[in-house]
Interface confidence: low
């Protein structure tokens, strides 16, 4: 007869490990016990557990609770256990001696290989500005054993770089991502991608980019200048930028204060029935955390007699 | 599959105790940060309190800071929630559920059990 | 805490009509936010995270938009199935908080 066994056994860290041994005999042969043991290079074995055929599975107090026989129906010739709960602690190498009749005794050896699966971080870097030269977005570190692989997925045009630190059972990996800050960014993804053997899926984390800026200020509605005529209603200004943070706005009037009457609503300012008295030169002021902008504009309300008196004085000249 | 049973609720009267248990079965429990969530009769979801994987990070709402502790075994791959000073408002069907497993931020919650009922009263 | 108000609080519709909730937050969350559907007597369950990604086994008929402050929940043609209740969740700070709630039922 001969024995069955895997080469290496690969668990997950907290899973259950199948340590295989299959005495495959001649008719007739039977199994009397299997002894486990660990048997690491340097050290001496270490008995698990006795699976006897008369008196069951005995587990030495080391393993206590942890190691068992695995489901019924149990074959006699299969002497297989299973050990509870993996830890890292228990990667080595196990051996399998099986005692038959009338045969005699078989041993095997096999690799128990615990895969740590990594919990990654992400860490956003500094705040980002538009206008900054190449800035960490975030950096993504994960441990595990085997070292994990760390990636990025994102359309943001960046550059990556990564460092690994060994550690005595495990690895760790960080990978940061660079680039270059711009309003265009804002919102958008950029995933932290972890592989490992450990896992069934990639682990992804996704951390949403924030980037400052403040757009140049402009004001509209000065675009026809012959619609701001003495007694025009409805007149209005707007100021125009944007920016992340939203910003906020404040007009004021550079050769005095906002006549009464003008109502300020955000962006916008609103004029009552137009005089002469409107006529001056306004300042919109945006401002974010990040910058702050001003735009000015000079109105000039025309008086429509004035117009026309001149239009008879220039008639009556000719 | 992740299977996640809650157990514990019952009846209890105004400043007594209880504890929830949430056994988890079918992946890495330990892998992930757990929330218990609650909701009273014909109301809304409203969190209560979260874990993070290896127990190390705890957060409460406000309405439970101080009376309730969430903790977790993850050799038994269990969740708990152990509450006193009990008052008739936290009356609810009670959830455990998991983090969402490729984010390492926030709550949202991808697994959920089928709950277990909480009564308050005297 | 941020508040998240969803409309409308329960609403009518037949089997192949297209539904949309909305959700707003009580201040700027980017796209942290979650939808979950909850049927009576049962545990709720993830349809969108990120705001707009479909969690995996989820019809693709339910969609999730927005960003900031308002988003959507649309059902593009509404089956038997969907008629339960629907809530948004911040996820942006702790603790985390869920909107009203919104009952779609059978016309």
């Known amino acids: 007869g001969e024995l069955e066994t895997s080469d290496v056994v690969t668990v997950v860290l907290g899973q259950d490990a199948k340590l295989p041994c299959f005495y495959r005999g001649d008719s007739g042969e039977q199994v009397g016990q299997v002894a486990w043991a660990r048997v690491d290079a340097g050290e001496g074995a270490q008995e698990l557990a006795l699976l006897h055929s008369k008196y069951g599975l005995h587990v030495s107090p080391a393993y206590e609770g942890r190691v068992e026989q695995p489901p019924p129906p149990r074959n006699p010739l299969d002497g297989s256990v299973l050990l509870r709960n993996a830890v890292q602690a228990d990667e080595g190498e196990y051996e399998c001696r099986v005692s038959t009749f009338p045969a005699g005794s078989f041993q095997a050896r096999l690799r128990l290989r615990v895969l740590v699966p990594p919990l990654p971080s992400l860490n956003p870097g500094p705040a980002l500005e538009e206008g900054q030269g190449l800035t960490l977005a975030a950096s993504c570190t994960a441990e595990g054993s085997p070292a994990p692989s760390v990636t990025w997925d994102t359309e943001v045009k960046g550059t990556t770089s990564s460092r690994s630190f060994k550690h005595s059972r495990s690895a760790a990996v960080t990978s940061e991502f660079h680039l270059v800050p711009s309003r265009s960014m804002n919102g958008q993804p950029l995933t932290c991608v972890v592989s490992h053997p450990g896992l069934l899926q990639d682990q992804r984390i996704t951390h949403i980019l924030h980037v400052s800026f403040l757009a140049e200020a402009s004001v509209r509605g000065l675009e026809d200048q012959n619609l701001w005529h003495i007694g025009r209603e409805g007149a209005m200004l707007k100021c125009l930028s944007e920016g992340q943070p939203p910003p906020s706005y404040n007009w004021t009037r550079l050769d005095g204060p906002l006549p009464s009457g003008v109502r300020v609503d955000g962006d916008t300012l609103g004029f009552p029935p137009l005089t002469t008295e409107h006529s001056g030169i306004y300042v919109c002021h945006v401002s974010n955390e990040f910058s702050s902008r001003d735009s000015q504009v000079t109105v000039d309300v025309l008086d429509p007699q004035e117009d026309s008196g001149k239009q008879v004085d220039l008639v009556s000249a000719s | 599959e992740v299977q996640l049973v809650e157990s514990g609720g019952g009846l209890v009267q105004p400043g007594g105790s209880l504890r929830l248990s949430c056994a988890a079965s079918g992946d890495i429990f330990g892998s992930y940060a757990m929330s218990w969530v609650r909701q009273a009769p014909g109301k809304g979801l409203e969190w209560v309190s979260r874990i993070s994987s290896h127990g190390a990070s705890r957060d409460y709402a406000d309405s439970v800071k101080g009376r309730f502790t969430i903790s977790r075994d993850n050799s038994k791959n269990t969740l708990y929630l152990q509450m006193n000073s009990l008052r008739a408002e936290d009356t609810a069907v009670y959830y455990c559920?998991?983090?969402?497993?490729?984010?390492?931020?926030?709550?949202?919650?991808?697994?959920w059990g089928q709950g277990t009922l909480v009564t308050v009263s005297s | 805490d941020i508040q998240m108000t969803q409309s409308p609080s329960s609403l009518s519709a037949s089997v192949g009509d297209r539904v949309t909730i909305t959700c707003r937050a009580s201040?700027?969350?980017?796209?942290?936010l979650a939808w979950y559907q909850q049927k009576p007597g049962k545990a709720p369950k993830l349809l969108i995270y990120a705001a707009s990604s479909l969690q995996s086994g989820v019809p693709s008929r339910f969609s999730g938009s927005g960003s900031g402050t308002d988003f959507t929940l649309t059902i593009s043609s509404l089956q038997p199935e969907d008629f339960a209740t629907y809530y948004c969740?911040?996820?942006?700070?702790?603790?985390?908080?869920f909107g009203q709630g919104t009952k779609v039922e059978i016309k």
């Open positions: 969740q911040q996820h942006y700070t702790t603790p985390p908080t």
């Open positions: 559920a998991r983090q969402t497993e490729d984010r390492s931020y926030g709550y949202d919650l991808d697994y």
């Open positions: 201040q700027g969350i980017s796209s942290y």
